[in-house]
């Protein structure tokens, strides 16, 4: 699986999950998030050669098409597969609120 | 929606579905598919600016991150959203077989 366990331990050029730390205030301008200051959102990148973690029949077909037609601009793209939520603390006036934001952390990638 | 109705009628630079005809024999080397000879598989391409058909909270965050950090390599990617099946005819020996291959035709795209 193209997950953090594999990708963070290997120098993988092809599609894999990459570490990306996002600081809410500095990187997003989100001053309203009090906790955490930031988090590892991670991201997916790298080429998608034929059959590499193909998401659908279409991505398999497109991968083969791209292999046999290297000049073609059409190829699968490395995108998030499994995502996890992130719990944040913010304030509404003086009232603290805790919310779980869904699909915030990329745990694995796929070629789609 | 970034679907064929919209994308095929507009000169859209950003993430959209693009027409792509694939000939089974010539483009994939699949001699075993007898009907159809080929089909419009289509594909997704184009930049994913902030908030453009964002698939998840992560793609929204990543889009904003990329807007505020233009030098960053991390950005959402334009990938298939809705796909449709394709019915094919092939032969096993002298016996004709008809099969519906799932997720073969891209009908719309998203930023993921």
């Amino acid at each position: 699986a193209l997950d953090t366990n594999y990708c963070f331990r290997n120098l993988e050029e092809n599609c894999c999950v990459r570490p990306l730390y996002i600081d809410f205030r500095q990187d997003l301008g989100w001053k309203w998030v009090h906790e955490p200051k930031g988090y590892y959102a991670n991201f997916c990148s790298g080429p998608c050669p034929y059959l590499r973690s193909a998401d659908t029949t279409h991505s398999t077909v497109l991968g083969l098409y791209n292999t046999l037609n290297p000049e073609a601009s059409a190829s699968p793209c490395c995108v998030p597969q499994d995502l996890e939520p992130l719990t944040i603390l913010y304030y509404v006036g003086r009232t603290p609120k805790v919310e779980q934001l869904s699909n915030m952390v990329v745990k694995s990638c796929k070629c789609s | 929606a970034l679907d064929t109705n919209y994308c095929f009628r507009n000169l859209e630079e950003n993430c959209c579905v693009r027409p792509l005809y694939i000939d089974f024999r010539q483009d994939l080397g699949w001699k075993w598919v007898h009907e159809p000879k080929g089909y419009y598989a289509n594909f997704c391409s184009g930049p994913c600016p902030y908030l453009r058909s964002a698939d998840t909270t992560h793609s929204t965050v990543l889009g904003l991150y990329n807007t505020l950090n233009p030098e960053a390599s991390a950005s959402p990617c334009c990938v298939p959203q809705d796909l449709e099946p394709l019915t094919i005819l092939y032969y096993v020996g002298r016996t004709p077989k008809v099969e519906q291959l799932s997720n073969m035709v891209v009908k719309s795209c998203k930023c993921s």
Partner: antibody, heavy 119, light 111 residues
Amino acid sequence: EVQLLESGGGLVQPGGSLRLSCAASGFDFNSYGMSWVRQAPGKGLELVADIVSKTYNYTTYYSDSVKDRFTISRDDSKSTVYLQMNSLRAEDTAVYYCTVAPGGSFDYWGQGTLVTVSS
Amino acid sequence: DIQLTQSPSSLSASVGDRVTITCRASQSVSISRFNLMHWYQHKPGKQPKLLIYRASNLASGVPSRFSGSGSGTDFTLTISSLQPEDFATYYCQHSRESPWTFGGGTKVEIK
């Protein structure tokens, strides 16, 4: 260009034997089924024998009229298909065509070889 | 086995005529939207030639005056404007199941 060249036809007495050969070129012989189709004088086309590719275990078919007397075989290394005809009868007199069916249709045909069974 | 019955067994026509030949199968030779019927032209002393595959697809190099239609059990070969070189015997053939079989043929003669 696809070419199918039959040979081995001729005059033979009833009860005798003949072996027809069909040398193929211009296509991926190993991938496709091969057939023998005949036309007897004043009659229509009849599929006599058929052999599919190695992928499908060289499965064979014979028409009822030739079953247990004719044997179809192929040598993929020589791109050749054969029809061994034993216990020949007068009603086997016909032009025998070698043909290839990549799908459900017989796309290419040889020029035919005449088999005459007569005493 | 699936039997194919062609009609007429022979016909006389003139150059320029529109000619229609039918082929009826003893059971359906269609599967899903695919119609597994094919048509051939056979001239004396020559090998048969594929004209139409899968009911309506023109084989390579075949003039557009030839067309095919039909589904299920009933199929038609049409020559829109008969030419001198079209006088021949025409056969249908199915590939719905093994064994594949041919129709009895339709001989097109000069009137």
